[in-house]
Amino acid sequence: PEPPTACREKQYLINSQCCSLCQPGQKLVSDCTEFTETECLPCGESEFLDTWNRETHCHQHKYCDPNLGLRVQQKGTSETDTICTCEEGWHCTSEACESCVLHRSCSPGFGVKQIATGVSDTICEPCPVGFFSNVSSAFEKCHPWTSCETKDLVVQQAGTNKTDVVCGPQDRLRA
């Protein structure tokens, strides 16, 4: 018969022969021959291969470097890489999460629209009319101005996006 030019799924072509690939979590130690099957060997601790493969070396698990603000979110196995995330108060600089930066704070006049996660930064929004923020914070939303009326008080000083209104007593009519 003609030697194959293509092989089935989970096989590879070598020396005009189709050999079985190694299963995820194992590396290749010997190609198959006419008389013998492919020989594989499981990856060692801190190593992985996540596909059917013919690799002769397993990949090292990612190291979540605490000096870069990283910690392990999910420990790697022989078939999966370690997943890193950032320490509290920090978030990843990229999808691969190779380093972390401190969450941004929203300046006075801005409030938190969306609190940061391990993978996304704080999203800020300007405080609209009727709301203010007088602090730089990664958590605080814009607060509504105090309603002087509900306290039987009057506005003595108008609010801004950075300051609350100042309430004061109503002027009494003199007799």
Epitope: C22, Q23, P24, G25, Q26, V29, S30, D31, T33, F35, T36, E37, E39, C40, L41, P42, C43, G44, E45, T56, T77, S78, E79
Partner: antibody, heavy 121, light 113 residues
Framework: QVQLKQSGPGLVQPSQSLSITCTVS????????LHWVRQSPGKGLEWLGV???????DYNAAFMSRLSITKDNSKSQVFFKMNSLQADDTAIYYC???????????????WGQGTSVTVSS | DIVMTQSPSSLAMSVGQKVTMSCKSS????????????LAWYQQRPGQSPKLLIY???TRESGVPDRFLGSGSGTDFTLTISSVQAEDLADYFC?????????FGSGTKLEIK
């Protein structure tokens, strides 16, 4: 039937090298890999390395800098060489045939008779 | 490297008795993809080379009597001899065949009373 016959010196001077030949019969070295293991009263059984059927090798990292395993398929011989021997390398050295059971499973199903090596001046 | 720990270091049994010996590994020998445990057992009679008894935790090598039973998973393994015979006088070693460097336990010496 499967046989592994070892030949090599019994006495080695400190700092000298040890060479052992494992001659196999009843199987081909192109079909099966061959391991080397040593046994001493102090350290028990220690796996030293393997030459796979394709000729590639894996060594125990503790011995990698001074260990070499090669073979001659046509003569059915595997050659073991370890350099810079010291007194604590005194042991019985074995060659052992690899058997592959699928799913990445390997074991040593036939062993040589062993070569007793003493390192002493 | 994976450390293999065997216990007891020795035991003495009478012919016909049931024998169990333990082997623990410093990390799991269970491959999560195929659910196989990569543990082998060897027998070494006095003055002889080791002989393979069991691989993949419980699969007996061809010609090994069925009184030898291997069990366990993950990090804890057991070799049981259901009815010990005089010819079972030997040292028994467990070995992880998960990955290189392959490592052995320090052995359990079985003596016959």
């Amino acid at each position: 039937q499967v046989q592994l016959k070892q030949s090599g010196p019994g006495l080695v001077q400190p700092s000298q090298s040890l060479s052992i030949t494992c001659t196999v019969s009843g199987f081909s070295l192109t079909t099966y890999g061959l391991h080397w293991v040593r046994q001493s009263p102090g350290k028990g059984l220690e796996w030293l390395g393997v030459i796979w059927r394709g000729g590639n090798t894996d060594y125990n990292a503790a011995f990698m800098s001074r260990l070499s395993i090669t073979k001659d398929n046509s003569k059915s011989q595997v050659f073991f060489k370890m350099n810079s021997l010291q007194a604590d390398d005194t042991a019985i050295y074995y060659c052992a045939k690899n058997s592959y059971y699928g799913n990445g499973g390997h074991a040593m199903d036939y062993w040589g008779q062993g070569t007793s090596v003493t390192v002493s001046s | 490297d994976i450390v293999m720990t065997q216990s007891p270091s020795s035991l003495a049994m009478s012919v016909g008795q049931k024998v169990t010996m333990s082997c623990k590994s410093s990390q799991s020998l269970l491959h999560s993809f195929n659910q196989k445990n990569y543990l082998a057992w060897y027998q070494q009679r006095p003055g002889q080379s080791p002989k393979l008894l069991i691989y993949f935790t419980s699969t007996r090598e061809s010609g090994v009597p069925d009184r030898f039973l291997g069990s366990g998973s993950g990090t804890d393994f057991t070799l049981t001899i259901s009815s010990v015979q005089a010819e079972d006088l030997a040292d028994y070693f467990c070995q992880q065949h998960y990955t290189t460097p392959f490592t052995f336990g320090s052995g359990t010496k079985l003596e016959i009373k």
